[in-house]
Interface confidence: low
């Protein structure tokens, strides 16, 4: 059976930690978990999200001993069958951006723009300065929009 | 290949003690969970004990049925399992298969109590 | 403890026809989106033969024949094209939680 395309899922004692399976699981392409089949080592029962396998599984029903995540360094927020954590995201200050909610071992950072800075695209890698007015603000600048310039010359109301 | 082979059983006395033993192979014996599964004649599969790796600190877990009369234990340097059967009843009589948690079982060796 | 039931108790089915087991579980045996759940087929004087594992994963060496399905608390054996080899008792089993607990059995006969 070690040929067989497993998975790994144990979850036998659930109560008691829980972190037992076998065959573990077992193949589960159906059911997307991450990092379930490697090199033909599987382990029977994932672990769960701000876990890691410390080690990896020789054989169908072989434990997977779960450690938690390096704690505001690593997370995983799926339950997965994988010896690594994902890393924390950066928040580039360089790239205009800070933190809003801090890396916990099961979600990752989440990051915002700085103040005065911008980003008006869904998925923001930098944010971009907000521009400063000579002539006046018709619209302030916002976490995702521009500031709006009046333009030399435009009365004003 | 893995393989399991029971063996241990008899004939015993109601009351009476047995200790069942399960030698395993072609797998790394140390890191796996194991369990004890038994089967009555004509009747369906009950689990009745488990024991987790060094690493799991060799918890154990019984069915109701066998709490404080069945001790399951294992020899990792001889990787091998056993099932320690005290006050032994007649509802006991049955196959007794090692089991991994990969779902292997072995061929089962037979226990039968009965005055 | 999960209680298995498994329906029906016995089942005759002609030769080449489709047969279908169910099980049902007491209550979910679902972790984290993995249902564990086994089938088994067991012949007289044999241990349980694993069959499926984690609800629809086909053991290796198992005829195609063979499928799982399900999830939660609800699953299903299908043997697509009855066998005379398939005559045997049937057994699920969930390992979500200890105890490890089993359907009844399902007899399937040829008929």
């Known amino acids: 059976r070690l040929s067989s395309k497993s998975v790994n899922a144990q979850v036998t004692d659930i109560n008691s930690k829980g972190l037992e399976l076998r065959k573990t699981v077992t193949t589960v392409e159906t059911q997307n978990l991450e990092g379930l089949h490697h090199d033909g080592q599987f382990c029977h029962k994932p672990c769960p999200p701000g876990e890691r396998k410390a080690r990896d599984c020789t054989v169908n029903g072989d434990e997977p001993d779960c450690v938690p995540c390096q704690e505001g360094k690593e997370y995983t927020d799926k339950a997965h069958f994988s010896s690594k954590c994902r890393r924390c995201r950066l928040c580039d200050e360089g790239h205009g951006l800070e933190v809003e909610i801090n890396c916990t071992r099961t979600q990752n950072t989440k990051c915002r723009c700085k103040p005065n800075f911008f980003c008006n695209s869904t998925v923001c890698e930098h944010c971009d300065p907000c521009t400063k007015c000579e002539h006046g603000i018709i619209k302030e600048c916002t976490l995702t929009s521009n500031t709006k310039c009046k333009e030399e010359g435009s009365r004003s109301n | 290949e893995v393989q399991l082979v029971e063996s241990g059983g008899g004939l015993v006395k109601p009351g009476g003690s047995l200790r069942l033993s399960c030698a395993a192979s072609?797998?790394?014996?140390?890191?796996?969970?194991m369990n004890w599964v038994r089967q009555a004649p004509g009747k369906g599969l009950e689990w009745v004990a488990r024991?987790?790796?060094?690493?799991?600190?060799?918890?154990?877990y019984y069915a109701e049925s066998v709490k404080d009369r069945f001790t399951i234990s294992r020899d990792d340097s001889k990787n091998t399992l056993y099932l320690q059967m005290n006050s032994l009843k007649t509802e006991d009589t049955a196959v007794y298969y090692c089991?991994?948690?990969?779902?292997?079982w072995g061929q089962g060796t037979t226990l039968t109590v009965s005055s | 403890d999960i209680v298995m039931t498994q329906s029906p108790d016995s089942l005759a089915v002609s030769l080449g026809e489709r047969a279908t087991i169910s099980c049902r579980a007491s209550?979910?045996?679902?972790?984290?989106?993995?249902?564990?759940m086994q089938w088994y087929q067991q012949k007289p004087g044999q241990p349980p033969k694993l069959l499926i594992y984690v609800a629809s994963n086909v053991e290796s060496g198992v005829p195609d024949r063979f499928s799982g399905s399900g999830s939660g608390t609800d699953f299903t054996l299908t043997i697509s094209s009855l066998q005379a080899e398939d005559v045997a008792v049937y057994f699920c089993q969930q390992s979500t939680k200890v105890p490890w607990t089993f359907g009844q059995g399902t007899k399937l006969e040829i008929k």
């Open positions: 024991i987790r790796s060094k690493s799991n600190n060799y918890a154990t």
């Open positions: 089991v991994t948690d990969g779902y292997y």
């Open positions: 072609g797998f790394t014996f140390n890191t796996n969970a």
């Open positions: 209550e979910s045996v679902e972790y984290y989106g993995t249902s564990l």
